[in-house]
Interface confidence: medium
Amino acid sequence: NSCELTNITIAIEKEECRFCISINTTWCAGYCYTRDLVYKDPARPKIQKTCTFKELVYETVRVPGCAHHADSLYTYPVATQCHCGKCDSDSTDCTVRGLGPSYCSFGEMKE
Amino acid sequence: APDVQDCPECTLQENPFFSQPGAPILQCMGCCFSRAYPTPLRSKKTMLVQKNVTSESTCCVAKSYNRVTVMGGFKVENHTACHCSTCYYHKS
């Protein structure tokens, strides 16, 4: 397996001001070993492992305001440890393809 | 740490448990790409239950296979092609 912490840029949206700010942070990316069973036993489904967080912390950033909107605080998760493990569907949207970490609904991106 | 891509590719390999001499059962196994990151606000708005993290994953699965019966009457899949595609059993 080669699932490890990777530097990424995430976009944080300031909806009411119609812009995003970009933040550099660390998250998990890489390759995990999986196999497709030849004998499918419904009673014992095999968990497939995915590159996800083992430990995370939350960080808070000040998002600047605009004309009629004050600055605000935004709290986001940061991975501190990664592993190939099961996707925890309580805290995680387990999908094939998401919007991506730097998705911004608006055209304007501020550093 | 060494700077390499160590994980073996998602390919066909012989299944030692179900294979018989002269009648190999092939199975898809290997590594596929996955990543996790904070869920964008746009995605959160579409969720009934908001999730702070998004995990994008693919798993090594059979693209095609033949159904065969092996010793002991077990019906198994003999995989014929593999790819990194949708994971079915990755959630807890």
Epitope: T6, Y31 | P2, F33
Partner: antibody, heavy 117, light 113 residues
């Protein structure tokens, strides 16, 4: 079946440029490190450049002998690896091979680059 | 940079003989976390591309005859051909894939008497 096919070699004058291509098939191109290796006539193999995989954001590495002159890149949509060679010198004359992954498990047939006035 | 040194630079042997060739690295290629040596051996026949024979210092690539054996750890490695065949005429290179720049040894040229 994994296949690597290099093209783009030829005769070029010192100071000139050339772009080599390595067309690949039979594997998931984005999953693998890709490397360029060259071999001057009758001499040893020399690693010159690498493009890491998607998980490593396709970051690149170069040998001291080509750094600043050669650029490795990928077209992931067509699974092609490129080597842009600029400011070519006589000592760059060699057969150029592309190879897959860090342990060079698969090699192309090579393409000859001759730098001569 | 990791320097790879091979010896001998050439050797001439008769068909059926057992031969060994050596490869030394200027620093250890053993990664303690997985106990793997990041060393490979290649065979290059005249006019052909190199072919991977051995990786992880001792794992034979699929399809490679079992007369080829890799051994060693850390900085000292050996490639052994238990019973040389005429088709083994080639140059043999060792290479480290622990770090960049990847480096090759100077090669051992095997000639058949």
């Amino acid at each position: 079946e994994v296949k690597l096919v290099e093209s783009g070699g030829g005769l070029v004058q010192p100071g000139g440029s050339l772009r080599l291509s390595c067309a690949t098939s039979g594997f998931t191109f984005s999953d693998f490190y890709m490397e360029w290796v060259r071999q001057p006539p009758g001499k040893r193999l020399e690693w010159i450049a690498a493009s890491r995989n998607k998980a490593k954001d396709y970051t690149t590495e170069y040998s001291a002998s080509v750094k600043g002159r050669f650029i490795v890149s990928r077209d992931t949509s067509q699974s092609i690896l490129y080597l842009q060679m600029n400011a070519l010198r006589a000592e760059d004359t060699a057969i150029y091979f592309c190879a897959r992954d860090a342990r060079f498990a698969y090699w192309g047939q090579g393409t000859l680059v001759t730098v001569s006035a | 940079d990791i320097v790879m040194s091979q010896s001998p630079s050439s050797l001439a042997v008769s068909v059926g003989e057992k031969i060994t060739m050596s490869c030394k690295s200027s620093q250890s290629l053993l990664y303690s976390s997985n106990q793997k040596n990041y060393l490979a051996w290649y065979q290059q026949k005249p006019g052909q591309s190199p072919k991977l024979l051995i990786y992880w210092a001792s794992t034979r690539e699929s399809g490679v005859p079992d007369r080829f054996t890799g051994s060693g750890s850390g900085t000292d490695f050996t490639l052994t051909i238990s019973s040389v065949k005429a088709e083994d005429l080639a140059v043999y290179y060792c290479q480290q894939y622990y770090s960049y720049p990847r480096t090759f040894g100077g090669g051992t040229k095997l000639e058949i008497k």
